[in-house]
Interface confidence: medium
């Protein structure tokens, strides 16, 4: 991943199309790996992680999972190649705007995990279902 | 500095077409979705039409569903709007607008200065 | 659509009032709420996003707050150029939609 002070540049090795041959450019993420949270019992979180990082590829779209045994919980936020898992799940929220938290059976602890598509979209973690839009692909084509 | 600067705009009769541009500089177009917006004389806001960054996907209000095409060219830095079947309705400055969404916070900004589309017989 | 509704429509205020105006949406939008300002014959100027974060550049005595379905714009001190006329905007669904604006006319 480009550190966040790096200016983003378009080379041979970064350019990436999609189906229509227009460049995609990579996205902006938090990024600060697995940390404690105090996340808990709410319908939303912010990450309170300070590093945004540009991805290093632009097909990768931001990630946060959230995790809670007995003993602590922790946040990660990541960037992620959508085409590949994560923690052995595929990503099938990953052209949402937002990032709103599904759980997945993890043996031993709480785990949920989200993916989204708009910048530093994985600031702000999303538990309710309230939270969630009407039509996500839609927002997405508006706003991101 | 991030500039818009709305087109094509003109008299019409109904029925008739124009077709709108939006150039842009400042920032990098083509990593960012564009929205149509419009005023009719006197009244308020009312959301056209928007595409994605990439111009892959596009989605239109109901009311011009059929009759208006929004496109871009990313590579000239502008933003099009296609209208065609033009109503009386359909009088107004017709704004467009760059979509952000930042850690789950959508909103339209910048706005150019806007183009007046009047459609009279 | 999720209906949005300013109040009031108008009103009348003097430089250094606190003006406060009010946005209701037809059903819960979390916080995914806009304020903008627009002048006659300029385009809409974003103030307020995410319905509390001032946008850079934009003067701190203007502020938002509210969340679900009822929201505030306040202008703590009201200045000569903030007369114009305001709208509120939902981005949680599909289509984004406005208020009908409240127009800022001096006293």
């Known amino acids: 991943t480009i550190p966040p002070h790096v200016q983003k540049s378009v080379n041979n090795d970064m350019i990436v199309t999609d189906n229509n041959g227009a460049v995609k450019f990579p996205q902006l993420c938090k990024f600060c790996d697995v940390r404690f949270s105090t996340c808990d019992n709410q319908k939303s979180c912010m990450s309170n992680c300070s590093i945004t990082s540009i991805c290093e590829k632009p097909q990768e779209v931001c990630v946060a999972v959230w995790r809670k045994n007995d003993e602590n919980i922790t946040l990660e936020t990541v960037c992620h190649d959508p085409k590949l898992p994560y923690h052995d799940f595929i990503l099938e929220d990953a052209a949402s705007p937002k990032c709103i938290m599904k759980e997945k059976k993890k043996p031993g602890e709480t785990f949920f995990m989200c993916s989204c598509s708009s910048d530093e979209c994985n600031d702000n973690i999303i538990f309710s279902e309230e939270y969630n839009t009407s039509n996500p692909d839609l927002l997405l084509v508006i706003f991101q | 500095q991030v500039q818009l600067v709305e087109s094509g705009g003109g008299l019409v009769q109904p029925g008739g077409s124009l077709r709108l541009s939006c150039a842009v500089s400042g920032f990098t177009f083509g990593r960012y979705a564009m929205s149509w917006v419009r005023q009719a004389p006197g009244k308020g806001l009312e959301w056209v039409s928007a595409i994605s960054a990439s111009g892959d996907r596009h989605h239109n209000t109901d009311s011009v569903k059929g009759r208006f095409s929004i496109s871009r060219d990313n590579s000239k830095n502008t933003l099009y709007l296609q209208m065609n079947s033009l109503r009386a309705e359909d009088t107004a400055v017709y704004f467009c607008?760059?979509?952000?969404?930042?850690?789950?916070?959508?909103?339209?900004?910048?706005w150019g200065q806007g183009t007046l589309v009047t459609v009279s017989s | 659509d999720i209906q949005m509704t300013q109040s009031p429509s108008s009103l009348s205020a003097s430089v250094g009032d606190r003006v406060t105006i009010t946005c209701r949406a037809s059903?819960?939008?979390?916080?995914?709420l806009n304020w903008y300002q627009q002048k006659p014959g300029k385009a809409p100027k974003l103030l307020i996003y995410?319905?509390?974060s001032l946008q850079s550049g934009v003067p701190s005595r203007f502020s938002g707050s509210g969340s679900g379905t009822d929201f505030t714009l306040t202008i703590s001190s009201l200045q000569p150029e903030d007369f114009a006329t305001y709208y509120c905007?939902?981005?949680?669904?599909?289509?984004?939609?406005f208020g009908q604006g409240t127009k800022v006319e001096i006293k």
């Open positions: 607008a760059k979509g952000i969404a930042k850690s789950g916070k959508n909103y339209f900004d910048p």
């Open positions: 059903q819960s939008i979390s916080s995914y």
């Open positions: 995410a319905a509390s």
């Open positions: 905007q939902q981005s949680y669904s599909t289509p984004p939609t």
